[in-house]
């Protein structure tokens, strides 16, 4: 699987999850988030060669098409597969509010 | 929606579904498929600027991060959203077999 366990331990040029730390205030301008100050959102990148973690029959077909037609511009792209939520703390007035934001952290990637 | 209705009628540079005809025999080497000879598989391509059909909170966050950090390599990618099956006819010996292959045709795209 193209997950953090594999990708963070290997120098992988092809589609894999990459570490990306986002600071809420500096990188997003979200000054209202109290905790955490930032988090590892991660991202997916790298080429999708033939059969690399193909998501659907279409991505398999497109990968094969690309192999047999190397000049083609149509190819699968490396995108998030498994995402996890992130729990944040912020204030509504003086009232603390804990909220879980869904799909915030990329744990693995796929070629789609 | 970034679907065939919209994308095929507009000269859209950003993420959209693009027409791609695949000939089973010539482009894939699938000589065994009797009918159809080929089909419009289509594909997704084009940049994913901030908030363009963002798929998840993560892709929204990544798009915003990219806007505020233009030099960053992390950005959402244009990939299939809705896929449709394709019905094919092939022969097992002399027995005709009609089969529906799932997720063969891209109908719309998203930024993921």
């Amino acid at each position: 699987a193209l997950d953090t366990n594999y990708c963070f331990r290997n120098l992988e040029e092809n589609c894999c999850v990459r570490p990306l730390y986002i600071d809420f205030r500096q990188d997003l301008g979200w000054k209202w988030v109290h905790e955490p100050k930032g988090y590892y959102a991660n991202f997916c990148s790298g080429p999708c060669p033939y059969l690399r973690s193909a998501d659907t029959t279409h991505s398999t077909v497109l990968g094969l098409y690309n192999t047999l037609n190397p000049e083609a511009s149509a190819s699968p792209c490396c995108v998030p597969q498994d995402l996890e939520p992130l729990t944040i703390l912020y204030y509504v007035g003086r009232t603390p509010k804990v909220e879980q934001l869904s799909n915030m952290v990329v744990k693995s990637c796929k070629c789609s | 929606a970034l679907d065939t209705n919209y994308c095929f009628r507009n000269l859209e540079e950003n993420c959209c579904v693009r027409p791609l005809y695949i000939d089973f025999r010539q482009d894939l080497g699938w000589k065994w498929v009797h009918e159809p000879k080929g089909y419009y598989a289509n594909f997704c391509s084009g940049p994913c600027p901030y908030l363009r059909s963002a798929d998840t909170t993560h892709s929204t966050v990544l798009g915003l991060y990219n806007t505020l950090n233009p030099e960053a390599s992390a950005s959402p990618c244009c990939v299939p959203q809705d896929l449709e099956p394709l019905t094919i006819l092939y022969y097992v010996g002399r027995t005709p077999k009609v089969e529906q292959l799932s997720n063969m045709v891209v109908k719309s795209c998203k930024c993921s």
């Epitope: 033939y50 059969l51 029959t57 398999t60 077909v61 094969l64 192999t67 047999l68 | 894939l28 080497g29 699938w30 000589k31 065994w32 092939y90 022969y91 097992v92 010996g93 002399r94 027995t95 077999k97 089969e99 292959l101 799932s102």
Partner: antibody, heavy 121, light 111 residues
Framework: EVQLVQSAAEVKKPGASVKVSCKTS????????MNWVQQAPGKGLDWMGQ????????NYNEMFEGRVTLTVDTSTSTAYMELSSLRAEDAAVYYC??????????????WGQGTLVTAST | DIVLTQTPASLAVSLGQRATISCRAS??????????MHWYQQKSGQPPKLLIY???NLESGVPARFSGSGSRTDFTLTIDPVEADDAATYYC?????????FGAGTKRNDA
């Protein structure tokens, strides 16, 4: 160079299941049908079924009474054959073999080395 | 199912001589202008190896000593001249009808 490398020999009890793998290399895995063939000791060849890796489409020989399941993992270019409810008469060498590519049912141009399955108490 | 009957079941031929193996199908295996009959060689402890496809076409890398002929229900594999390395069991296979079937095999021994 086209290669089909099968998993090691297995000893199973009657009633159990066995899953044999066939790892391929040297060709486009999603372009050709993959066949499975049984050869009982000192006997001839029996075609069990086939799978098309790109779509997962399958065709089975009724002789195996729905006990055979063929699957693939395209990310590793590996085909699998699972035989359930093993009987003593299932003791055999099992081969994966690539179809020639012109038809679904076809001549088989490349074969794995075979996996011996023994069903014994 | 199409039954393929191979004769003889075993064959002893002297080196340098001609060996002929017959395969008879219970019904025609011809369609679309092709004869869907193929021949394989299997040596002891090895997987089968494709020799002849579509009745008469020599598979790449197979010596020209091997040839195939026939149509409809009657097919022949010929080895001429026979060499010591040809000691093996030979199988015919049809794919004109589902299920794909093999003959019972012909074992070639040294005379």
């Amino acid at each position: 160079e086209v290669q089909l490398v099968q998993s090691a020999a297995e000893v199973k009890k009657p009633g159990a299941s066995v899953k044999v793998s066939c790892k391929t290399s040297g060709y486009s895995f999603t372009t050709y049908w993959m066949n499975w063939v049984q050869q009982a000791p000192g006997k001839g060849l029996d075609w069990m079924g086939q799978i098309f890796p790109a779509s997962g489409s399958t065709n089975y020989n009724e002789m195996f009474e729905g006990r055979v399941t063929l699957t693939v993992d395209t990310s590793t270019s590996t085909a699998y054959m699972e035989l359930s409810s093993l009987r003593a008469e299932d003791a055999a060498v099992y081969y994966c073999a690539r179809g020639d590519g012109n038809y679904a049912l076809d001549a088989m141009d490349y074969w794995g080395q075979g996996t011996l399955v023994t069903a014994s108490t | 199912d199409i039954v393929l009957t191979q004769t003889p079941a075993s064959l002893a031929v002297s080196l340098g001589q001609r060996a002929t193996i017959s395969c008879r199908a219970s019904e025609s295996v011809d369609s679309y202008g092709n004869s869907f009959m193929h021949w394989y060689q299997q040596k002891s402890g090895q997987p089968p190896k494709l020799l002849i496809y579509l009745a008469s076409n020599l598979e790449s890398g197979v010596p020209a000593r091997f040839s195939g002929s026939g149509s409809r229900t009657d097919f022949t594999l010929t080895i001429d001249p026979v060499e010591a390395d040809d000691a093996a069991t030979y199988y015919c296979q049809q794919n004109n009808e589902d299920p794909l079937t093999f003959g019972a095999g012909t074992k070639r021994n040294d005379a």
